[in-house]
Interface confidence: low
């Protein structure tokens, strides 16, 4: 064999014994009849040698190191050659080493031609025996970036201050090219940047520098992932350790092009993002470690790139073609923590136009799909307007307030379904009749169903909320003077199972002057709690509401008020309450701004409770809570 190294080539060749084997017969390098076990050839030297055995590959290895100095002169950038050519070298296991030294301010980029690289962990080996070991430098300290095989996703590695690349080729491997080039870049202001390119579905396992040992203190390392826009990437941490930080925090940051909240910071113990569309960067940041007990920071993670999962391949048809004046919005439900990045969660129209919010309008059939790791992050809000413009046509007309089944079949939770019920002013009023009698939600007897009806005035200038009502009570109907909104609000996913309990009919009825009339038919078993509209804010000025309370023939009703005085202070007018027996028309009138409220009273027949407000002074509002309890007449009430 003859190896001649050109002068000024900065190449050193070293042939030395490899890992010792149990071969009985030793083997030597023979030069000028001398037998040696190590041979070093420097640039400008020419050496002729042979081996003393038939299979030197079982005994020796060869290292070819080229030092590239970018400190004192220009760098030889471009495609890196294998020098000397592999055909001129003895067939030993070969390691080509390129040691590039550069200024701190210079970025160096290794570019790998296809096939790209795949990082391997400790104890792993490459199937074809070809390995790339890459290390960097922080001042005088060598930092291992990682060991890589062929056939992966790593296309580029950027470093600063210097790079050492070792390409190990087994003696039998025919490779005669390095497979990479070097380019100069501006400062990257971090230890290194590893670019990983996905052409299609696949996964990559990557590790922090020095893995499984500790990541250098207070350093920053970035991975850039290039992912086709139609695919989704998810990150999972396979193994990590945290060091003991004295200052700052160890963390990972995600940078997603186009996101308005870059960079987004996660602790290593957090659940990492999934279902990210397109390119993204992940950075690992170390901290200032405790000098006495530093511990180690290390991270091994996997990026999985795949076609969107689960619901995303399902198409849902939302048929609103027979609906009028209706809009359905699918949107993110509010989350408390808003300084955290959460992976994208999108709803798509016709599988093409994807956004975090989507509004569908009536008159069409819509095809939608979802691109979301967790559909509980979305909810639906629906609005429908039922209006009457001609009182002659609408009177006595009824409409069913039901959530259409198309909407219930969507995989997203319904939050609100609001019906806006509009009537011609001073011509018609409305009556709501539930399929199942309703209970008014109060602190004393809260609703515990999976949904409620929220009834409020829909007149812009009027701040009037009648209350929240759920199935399973004593309210048989609610009559309201003018425009209202009725919102079915769900509180639990179990609404899907309880959907059959919903059912409200609205009818247009002749106009009446009171703001609202509640018809109550109490059950003998339970206490009925009722409260004035606008609880906590007070009944609006000059508003009048009534309760029509039925008492069966064999029962007695006990009417109880829950405070001694109403608390209202009138600026103008008077606030009063009338309790009137329906059979005899006998009535008691109480001045709410002066009198104490009545003590519990017993009623043998159906009766009215009417409450009318004055114009109260601010802060002294009218809020009343009362209950009705039925007991059999046979009980001695004395």
């Amino acid at each position: 064999f003859e190896i001649a190294l050109p002068r000024e080539s900065n190449i050193t060749v070293l042939i030395k014994l490899g890992t010792p084997t149990l071969l009985a017969k030793p083997c030597y390098i023979v030069i000028s009849k001398r037998h040696i076990t190590m041979l070093s050839i420097k640039s400008g030297e020419r050496i002729v040698f042979t081996f003393s055995c038939q299979s030197p590959e079982n005994h020796f290895v060869i290292e070819i190191q080229k030092n590239i100095d970018c400190m004192s002169g220009p760098c030889p950038f471009g495609e890196v050659q294998l020098q000397p050519s592999t055909s001129l070298l003895p067939t030993l296991n070969r390691t080509f080493i390129w040691d590039v030294k550069a200024h701190k301010s210079i970025g160096l980029e290794l570019q790998f031609s296809i096939p790209r690289l795949r990082q391997i962990g400790p104890g792993e080996s490459c199937p074809d025996g070809v390995t790339h070991s890459i290390s960097g430098r922080i001042d005088a300290t060598v930092v291992r970036i990682g060991t890589f095989c062929s056939n992966g996703t790593v296309s580029r590695i950027k470093m600063q201050e210097g790079v050492k690349m070792a390409l190990h080729l087994p003696w039998f491997h025919p490779r005669n090219v390095s497979g990479f080039s070097i380019a100069n870049r501006s400062s990257i202001k971090r230890l290194c940047i590893i670019e990983s390119v996905f052409e299609g579905e696949g996964s990559a396992t990557l590790m922090s520098a020095n893995y499984p040992e500790g990541f250098p203190e207070d350093e920053l390392m970035t991975w850039q992932f290039v992912v086709p826009a139609h695919l989704r990437a998810s990150v999972s941490f396979l193994n990590f350790n945290l060091s003991n930080c004295e200052r700052k925090e160890e963390r990972v940051e995600y940078y997603i092009p186009g996101s308005t909240t870059n960079p987004e910071v996660f602790k290593l113990e957090d659940k990492q993002p999934g279902n990210m569309a397109g390119n993204f960067n992940l950075s690992l940041q170390g901290c200032d470690q405790d000098a006495q007990s530093p511990g180690i920071l290390r991270l091994q993670f996997q990026v999985l790139v795949q076609h969107p999962q689960n619901e995303s391949n399902k198409i849902y048809v939302v048929d609103l073609s027979n609906e009028r004046a209706m809009s359905l919005t699918i949107e993110p439900r509010p989350v408390k923590q808003s300084r955290k990045f959460v992976p994208g969660c999108f709803v798509c129209l016709e599988s093409r136009t994807c956004s975090s919010n989507l509004t569908l309008t009536s008159g069409s059939k819509h095809k939608i799909s979802f691109l979301c790791d967790d559909l509980t992050r979305l909810w639906m809000n629906v609005e429908k307007t039922i209006s009457c413009t001609d009182h002659r046509y609408c009177q006595r007309k009824s409409y069913s307030l039901q959530v259409p089944s198309d909407i219930l079949h969507l995989p997203v939770e319904l939050h609100d379904f609001s019906w806006k019920l509009l009537v011609p002013k001073d011509r018609l009023s409305l009556v709501l009749v539930p399929a199942q009698k309703l209970q008014q939600h109060t602190h004393e007897k809260p609703c515990n169903t999976s949904f409620s009806y929220l009834v409020a005035s829909a007149i812009p200038s009027q701040d009037l909320y009648f209350g929240s009502f759920c199935p399973g009570g004593s309210i048989k109907q609610i009559q309201v003077k003018q425009n209202i909104s009725v919102t079915l609000r769900t509180f639990a996913p179990s609404f899907q199972q309880e959907a059959s309990r919903q059912g409200l009919t609205v009818s247009f009825i002749p106009y009446f002057k009171e703001e609202g009339v509640f018809t109550v038919t109490p059950d003998t078993k339970s206490k009925v709690y009722l409260r004035t509209p606008n609880w906590d804010r007070g009944l609006p000025s000059l508003t009048s509401v009534s309760w029509n309370i039925s008492v069966p023939r064999d029962q007695v009703a006990c009417l109880t008020f829950f405070k001694e005085r109403s608390g209202v202070v009138c600026q103008t007018g008077r606030a009063f309450m009338i309790i009137q027996e329906q059979r005899t028309r006998a009535e008691e009138i109480f001045s709410l701004d002066e009198d104490v409220l009545p003590k519990p009273s017993f009623h043998h027949h159906s009766f009215w409770v009417n409450i009318s407000n004055c114009s109260p002074t601010s802060g002294k509002q009218l809020d009343l809570l009362f209950s009705v309890t039925l007991t059999p007449r046979t009980v001695d009430l004395t």
Partner: antibody
Framework: EVKLVESGPGLVAPSQSLSITCTVS????????VHWVRQPPGKGLEWLVV???????TYNSALKSRLSINKDNSKSQVFLKMNSLQTDDTAMYYC?????????????WGQGTTVTVSS | DIVMTQTPASLAVSLGQRATISCRAS??????????MHWYQQKPGQPPKLLIY???NLESGIPARFSGSGSRTDFTLTINPVEADDVATYYC?????????FGGGTKLEIK
């Protein structure tokens, strides 16, 4: 269009407390944090406190014992209260929108409200 | 607290020339690969206006005459070329650690 409008009493007697309201429009308090910064006449800027979108707060430790901040998301209002005012609390008080969730810079500022501490 | 020292306190520059304002932090304001240093412009009778965020990023709508550079403790705001409309006081601010502190300001005038 993003707008922040501060409203305050103008004149406060020494040892009394100060309440200022910042009413915002064009963005939601559930998405962005709001900072308070003050500037004494002819002097530089001093950061006081921030209330984040999730309701968490970060105070300037030097003033923490005298400051309190809260907000009403539905009314798009942020309230600053400062106790035990002295003449050196005389300043222009600004509220400002947090730029991005992670930068803690301030990209939109109100016109400020002048607070004079004098008997 | 991190103390921000701005130099010079005032600066007079001819129209069309370059203005350079320095800001030095008493400790590093870098975290996680980012410098949490921002620059504001304040004209008399007006609130401050964000020019540069995170040391070198130009806020949208701000002319490219303004640029920022630096890391860790030393930062620079450069205006090149200076225009008449740039007469104002310029402040640096760090947001790496609370309390988020401002520099004392640099008043820019035209020669």
């Amino acid at each position: 269009e993003v707008k922040l409008v501060e409203s305050g009493p103008g004149l406060v007697a020494p040892s009394q407390s100060l309440s200022i309201t910042c009413t915002v429009s064009g963005f939601s308090l559930t998405t962005y944090g709001v900072h308070w910064v003050r500037q004494p006449p002819g002097k530089g800027l001093e950061w006081l406190v921030v209330i984040w979108s999730d309701g968490n707060t970060t105070y300037n430790s030097a003033l923490k014992s005298r400051l309190s901040i809260n907000k009403d998301n539905s009314k798009s209002q942020v309230f600053l209260k400062m106790n035990s005012l002295q003449t050196d609390d005389t300043a222009m008080y600004y509220c400002a929108k947090n730029y991005r969730n992670y930068d803690y810079a301030m990209d939109y500022w109100g016109q400020g409200t002048t607070v004079t501490v004098s008997s | 607290d991190i103390v921000m020292t701005q130099t010079p306190a005032s600066l007079a520059v001819s129209l069309g020339q370059r203005a350079t304002i320095s800001c030095r932090a008493s400790e590093s304001v870098d975290s996680y690969g980012n410098s949490f240093m921002h620059w504001y412009q304040q004209k008399p009778g007006q609130p401050p206006k964000l020019l540069i965020y995170r040391a070198s990023n130009l806020e949208s709508g701000i002319p490219a005459r303004f640029s920022g550079s630096g890391s860790r403790t030393d930062f620079t705001l450069t205006i090149n070329p200076v225009e008449a409309d740039d007469v104002a006081t310029y402040y640096c601010q760090q947001s790496n650690e609370d309390p988020y502190t401002f520099g004392g300001g640099t008043k820019l005038e035209i020669k």
